[in-house]
């Protein structure tokens, strides 16, 4: 079914994202984000 | 730049520490792993120092291997050693988040060879 | 523990031909892998990073592919200064344990 499918790729997604945000913690960005300016 | 010093010839049993020197960037904002290379074998990852500060091993480097750092320097501690621990050690540099290939750094290594 | 798993262990190819290098990870890694040459004496050297990025300097012969669990080292148009030992290296996440990394076992490229 593909809700099914499509459900399935974004929940891979959002753990692929938070992989990635994990992993930056550890290895540090290349780019630092500036804090803006309220 | 990195490299590596302090390998040398110890009998088992024998603790050794392996220190990474580093130069021309800094420490706070790059990891650094230590991986190990058994003569003609194959490369096996040790741990990673994260730049924030916290590291993490392989499982079965946990307890025997510690790595810490300075404001240049990366140490590796080692206890208990083995034959099995003889290998050359490498210091490498690690890619940051949205970093590219320059990134990667390899030291020459420093051969430690563990016998009686 | 993330486990590597590098096919074939050896594989011998002719100037100019093709060689495929299987990665396998015992669990998901998304993109997470890199993959290097090594030759005797040397350090490792950085091919490929991001399971498909190429890093710089390096031919564009050297090609990357795959996400999840299965990955692959394409070398096209075979030189004979690709006669080396190639390594996967696989990086992941665990809720448990935290960051983690292991190495495939390594695939020897003989040019003939």
């Known amino acids: 079914h593909s809700d099914g499918i499509f459900t399935d790729s974004y929940s891979r997604y959002r753990k692929q994202m938070a992989v990635k945000k994990y992993l930056a913690a550890v290895l540090g960005k290349r780019y630092k984000q500036r804090v803006k300016n309220k | 730049s990195v490299e590596e010093s302090g390998g040398r010839l110890v009998t088992p049993g024998t603790p050794l520490t392996l220190t990474c020197t580093v130069s021309?960037?800094?420490?706070?904002?790059?990891?650094m792993s230590w991986v190990r290379q058994a003569p003609g074998k194959g490369l096996e990852w040790i741990g990673i120092?994260?730049?924030?500060?916290i590291t993490y091993y392989a499982s079965w480097a946990k307890g025997r291997f510690t790595i810490s750092k300075t404001s240049t320097t990366v140490d590796l501690k080692m206890t208990s050693l083995t034959t099995e621990d003889t290998a050359t050690y490498f210091c490498?540099?690690?890619?940051?988040?949205?970093?590219?290939?320059?990134?990667?750094?390899w030291g020459p290594g420093t051969l430690v060879t563990v016998s009686s | 523990a993330i486990k590597m798993t590098q096919t074939p262990s050896s594989v011998s190819a002719a100037v100019g031909g093709t060689v495929t290098i299987n990665c396998q990870a015992s669990?998901?890694?998304?993109?997470?892998l890199a993959w290097y040459q090594q030759k005797p004496g040397q350090p490792p050297n950085l091919l490929i990073y991001?399971?498909?990025d190429l890093a710089s300097g390096v031919p564009s012969r050297f090609s990357g592919s795959g996400d999840g669990t299965q990955f692959t080292l394409t070398i096209s148009a075979v030189q004979c200064e690709d006669a080396a030992t190639y390594y996967c290296?696989?990086?992941?996440?665990?809720?448990?344990?935290?960051?983690?990394?292991?190495f495939g076992g390594g695939t020897e490229v003989v040019v003939k």
């Open positions: 490498t540099r690690e890619i940051r988040d949205d970093g590219d290939s320059s990134d990667k750094l």
């Open positions: 021309g960037f800094s420490l706070n904002n790059y990891a």
């Open positions: 120092m994260g730049v924030n500060d």
């Open positions: 669990e998901d890694i998304y993109t997470n």
């Open positions: 991001d399971a498909s």
């Open positions: 290296q696989g990086v992941a996440w665990s809720s448990n344990t935290g960051y983690g990394s292991a």
